[in-house]
């Protein structure tokens, strides 16, 4: 749903959707679709997986990821961490904003059992112009993408 | 950090709650209470389970459903799908907006074990006047209603 | 219930974070950090675990709690209840607003298995000036605090 960033008129908002390219396997944040289908940017920008704030203020930020698997992959940690993190030009490390830990694999009582789980995060944070918010999932091998409706990332100014 | 909104404008919002009549067993969407208790409509209308948009714009839409059971009913799919879907007068199919899949039954290690789970969805979507949003749960037999606080559906313009 | 937002007025919002002092073991609501780190209050106040409304209107209220354990403590109910409740000067009892029930312990198949789960709640409710909203978790022994990113409580006017 494209992009609208009119100064002084619209309330900044965005909804980014999961795509085949979301999972990089590089240890970096998840990447997102910004234009096609349900995705849009309005008063926010995007760069390398990050929502970039163009107007300082308080934002409700949110993310959902769809998890799933057949049993548990060898070497998979029993904990899945899904979080929203802030990157700021004035600080070298990412800052945790909102984080969840889940043990979805424990639900599958046999190694061949199919299981699904979903993790949702949302909360209000203050963001300065130029600051970036990213989504990370550890272990991202369990994120199940499909059509942009099951894993997504968004924000709006409150 | 000031935010401006023009005086006398009401921001569309709604919160609908689960009721005994929510589960129809007909394959249709869940039905909701619109007036009693915590439920309300403000600048949105309601028809046959659907929130109906009267003013085009970007809306944060959300739903939570309370799931529960004793073991797993025979014939129950191992996956529960909870989703928000869009209906429009000029388009023949429902469009998926936000969807979650969960396998809550897998938690119960014996057939007589009581289990509970909850599914929350929320995200920003663009809606045109006249478009409708509904909630579906497959299999709805696992939705546990009580007093409108555990399963609900809402939206507000952002 | 019409709500106006005069131009140049700050929109009430808050985000409170979990801290070591959050779990009192007294049967009362969870307590929260209001100023340090990511926590803030803007147009809302705080008292003994409660967000206190200073301006009547519709608010999106939300809470997330991080649950976790090693197996299940003896005497632990199989159901964990996480809820947002309203206290009002004109009514002696707390009113349930948004509630979730989960059975996270059921995921751990052995008594020594580490497990994690997260519960998120969010929805729009009407609140009058002077009314209070609190978070309760039963059994709060399973709430896992760390740095304010995993368990939190917030609201903003819509």
């Amino acid at each position: 749903l494209i992009q609208e960033r009119r100064s002084h008129e619209v309330n900044p908002a965005a909804h980014l959707t999961g795509a085949n390219s979301s999972l990089t396997g590089s240890g970096g944040p998840l990447l997102w679709e910004t234009q096609l289908g349900l995705a849009f940017l309005r008063g926010l920008s995007y760069h390398d997986g990050a929502l970039v704030v163009t107007k300082a203020g308080y934002y409700y930020i949110y993310s959902k990821v769809q998890l799933g698997g057949v049993g548990c992959p060898l070497g998979l940690a029993s904990t899945i961490t899904h979080g929203l993190y802030k990157r700021t030009p004035r600080y070298p490390e990412e800052l945790e904003l909102l984080v969840s830990q889940q043990s979805p694999c424990g639900r599958a009582t046999s190694s061949s059992r199919v299981w699904w789980d979903s993790s949702f995060l949302g909360g209000v944070v203050h963001l300065e112009a130029g600051e970036k918010v990213v989504v990370r999932v550890l272990d991202e091998r369990l994120v199940r993408l499909r059509d942009g409706t099951r894993s997504y990332f968004g924000a709006f100014m409150v | 950090l000031i935010q401006e909104r023009r005086s006398h404008e009401v921001n569309p919002a709604a919160h609908l709650t689960g009721a005994n009549s929510s589960l129809t067993g007909s394959g249709g969407p869940l039905l909701w209470e619109t007036q009693l208790g915590l439920a309300f409509l403000r600048g949105l209308s309601y028809h046959d389970g659907a929130l109906v948009v009267t003013k085009a714009g970007y809306y944060y839409i959300y739903s939570k459903v309370q799931l529960g059971g004793v073991g797993c009913p025979l014939g129950l799919a191992s996956t529960i799908t909870h989703g928000l879907y869009k209906r429009t007068p000029r388009y023949p199919e429902e469009l998926e907006l936000l969807v979650s899949q969960q396998s809550p039954c897998g938690r119960a290690t014996s057939s007589s074990r009581v289990w509970w789970d909850s599914s929350f969805l929320g995200g920003v979507v663009h809606l045109e006047a006249g478009e409708k949003v509904v909630v579906r749960v497959l299999d709805e037999r696992l939705v546990r209603l009580r007093d409108g606080t555990r399963s609900y559906f809402g939206a507000f313009m952002v | 219930l019409i709500q106006e937002r005069r131009s140049h007025e700050v929109n009430p919002a808050a985000h409170l974070t979990g801290a070591n002092s959050s779990l009192t073991g007294s049967g009362g609501p969870l307590l929260w950090e209001t100023q340090l780190g990511l926590a803030f209050l803007r147009g809302l106040s705080y008292h003994d675990g409660a967000l206190v409304v200073t301006k009547a209107g519709y608010y999106y209220i939300y809470s997330k709690v991080q649950l976790g354990g090693v197996g299940c403590p003896l005497g632990l109910a199989s159901t964990i209840t996480h809820g947002l409740y309203k206290r009002t000067p004109r009514y002696p009892e707390e009113l349930e607003l948004l509630v979730s029930q989960q059975s996270p312990c059921g995921r751990a198949t052995s008594s020594s298995r580490v497990w994690w789960d997260s519960s998120f709640l969010g929805g729009v409710v009407h609140l009058e000036a002077g009314e209070k909203v609190v978070v309760r978790v039963l059994d709060e022994r399973l709430v896992r605090l760390r740095d304010g990113t995993r368990s939190y409580f917030g609201a903003f006017m819509v």
Epitope: L1, I2, Q3, E4, R5, R6, S7, Q35, L36, G37, F40, R42, G43, S45, Y46, H47, V52, T54 | T88, R90, Y91, L95, H126 | -
Partner: antibody
């Protein structure tokens, strides 16, 4: 009024390069992506790529990734498309276009005719 | 890439006629289809977005329908100013693609 004003026609030799400009007015330039589309004579439209004027981020159609390069000059609210190693197949009208809220391409430049000929 | 096939290539009509232009996608694109009109030596003009949604300033005689892979642009009671090329465009997958166009001409 929202306008996208493109540079005039260009005649270039095979193997040469050309730079087409698109000057935006009537809105905040950094608030909307600029897309580039080409139309060969009597043919359909082909999407080349887009640029985010706010941060210079780009996305290209794989078909054009080696020949097209998109840039912006925020100070003049102008987007540029640099086309290199041109062949006669690249003779076409090149359009810049802009999205708007929930609409694809309600705003278009008037087009720039690029002719590649020896 | 998603291929959009428009038919017919040319449609000859008389003003006052009602016509339907077809656009077929090589795979499902949900409702992510848009229609443009282009007159000779002019830039394209957006007519319909997301299969059926109307655009401000576009006459109500233009309407869209369809889903999945089959889409239709209908012009109720064609007027002389409607003659020109009509293109469909998908925004479901990168790269964005356009149909080859249908030429609406005077019979």
């Amino acid at each position: 009024e929202i306008q996208l004003q493109q540079s005039g026609p260009d005649l270039v030799k095979p193997g040469a390069s050309v730079k087409v400009s698109c000057k935006a007015s009537g809105y905040s330039f950094t608030d909307y992506y600029i897309y580039w589309v080409r139309q060969s004579h009597g043919k359909s439209l082909e999407w080349i790529g887009y640029i985010d004027p706010y941060n210079g981020g780009t996305k290209y159609n794989q078909k054009f990734k080696d020949t097209a390069s998109l840039t912006v000059d925020k100070s003049s609210s102008t987007a540029f498309m640099h086309l290199n190693s041109l062949t006669s197949e690249d003779s076409a009208v090149y359009y810049c276009a802009r999205t708007s809220g929930s609409s694809w391409f309600p705003y278009w430049g008037q087009g720039t005719l690029v002719t590649v000929s020896a | 890439d998603i291929v959009l096939t428009q038919s017919p290539a040319t449609l000859s009509v008389t003003p006052g006629d009602s016509v339907s232009l077809s656009c077929r996608a090589s795979q499902s694109i949900s409702n992510n289809l848009h229609w443009y009109q282009q007159k000779s030596h002019e830039s394209p003009r957006l007519l319909i977005k997301y299969t059926y949604q109307s655009i401000s300033g576009i006459p109500s005689r233009f309407s869209g329908s369809g889903s999945g892979t089959d889409f239709t642009l209908t012009i109720n009671s064609v007027e002389t100013e409607d003659f020109g090329m009509y293109f469909c465009q998908q925004s479901n997958r990168w790269p964005l693609t356009f149909g080859a166009g249908t030429k609406l001409e005077l019979k």
